[in-house]
């Protein structure tokens, strides 16, 4: 998988869209690792 | 609404070091990471390096790595790329962009900054 | 590094016409590419994202495809407000890696 900071972005982004953006509000770009994915 | 909003034009000679700033707002500066773009005249644009404002981590590009130096200000929103031993190469316009997701998922880039290099 | 050859350099086209732009990548990238477009003195504005995802607020008009090596920006029906030079990026690997630029006039 990609883990560049824009992929790592673009994924969160459509984590956050799948859930309906109900996920703690420290999920963030820059302090979920790849691992988190 | 999301503002990226770099420093003034700049005009160095050859061998100096400049530093311009990228002022964040209207979003969590510390949630997104911040990169530097340089497009230099009738050239593509090349990609500088990425910095994490979370913990200051940064990947640079190798044809930068050693000359060029990423930085944050948390405190004051504030991103900053330095870039040292200036060539006539290096005139350009230096732009900071980033990948938001929250207020809006869209891709921000600042108004660019002019830095010339002349003797 | 990844090279990305955007074809062509430049092109001219009519208001309405369809106009394609291809960006081929030098080694497989997934779906990880970008476009932006670019207006003179103007910074660069994102369009695409993930080959085929238009950001919120850009134009319908506006579509990406492909995967691997091979990438496209279409224009379905071009306007005069879409003169401008267009960049693709492929963001899978580090360095970041952009287009040559293809510049977009009217006829």
């Known amino acids: 998988a990609c883990d560049t900071a824009t992929c790592v972005t673009h994924r969160l982004a459509g984590l956050l869209s799948r859930s309906g953006g109900v996920v703690k509000n420290n999920f963030v770009p820059t302090n979920v690792g790849s691992k988190a994915f | 609404e999301v503002q990226l909003v770099q420093s003034g034009a700049e005009v160095k000679k050859p061998g100096a070091s400049v530093k311009v700033s990228c002022k964040a707002s209207?979003?969590?500066?510390?949630?997104?990471?911040m990169n530097w773009v340089r497009q230099a005249p009738g050239q593509r644009l090349e990609w500088i390096g990425v910095?994490?404002?979370?913990?200051?981590?940064?990947t640079y590009n190798r044809k930068f790595k050693g000359r060029a130096t990423l930085t944050v200000d948390k405190s004051a929103s504030t991103a900053y790329m330095e870039l040292s031993s200036l060539r006539s190469e290096d005139t350009a316009v230096y732009y900071c962009?980033?990948?938001?997701?929250?207020?809006?998922?869209?891709?921000?880039w600042g108004q660019g900054t002019t830095v010339t290099v002349s003797s | 590094d990844i090279q990305m050859t955007q074809s062509p350099s430049s092109l001219s086209a009519s208001v309405g016409d369809r106009v394609t732009i291809t960006c081929k990548a030098s080694?497989?990238?997934?779906?990880?590419v970008a476009w932006y477009q670019q207006k003179p003195g103007k910074s660069p504005k994102a369009l695409i994202y993930?080959?085929?995802y238009r950001y919120s607020g850009v134009p319908s008009r506006f579509s990406g495809s492909g995967s691997g090596t091979d990438f496209t920006l279409t224009i379905s029906s071009l306007q005069p407000e879409d003169v401008a030079t267009y960049h693709c990026?492929?963001?899978?690997?580090?360095?970041?890696?952009f287009g040559q630029g293809t510049k977009l006039e009217i006829k």
């Open positions: 962009a980033s990948l938001l997701i929250r207020p809006h998922y869209f891709d921000y």
């Open positions: 209207g979003y969590t500066f510390t949630d997104y990471y």
């Open positions: 910095i994490n404002p979370y913990n200051v981590r940064t």
């Open positions: 990026q492929q963001y899978n690997f580090y360095p970041y890696t």
């Open positions: 993930s080959a085929s």
């Open positions: 080694q497989n990238v997934g779906t990880n």
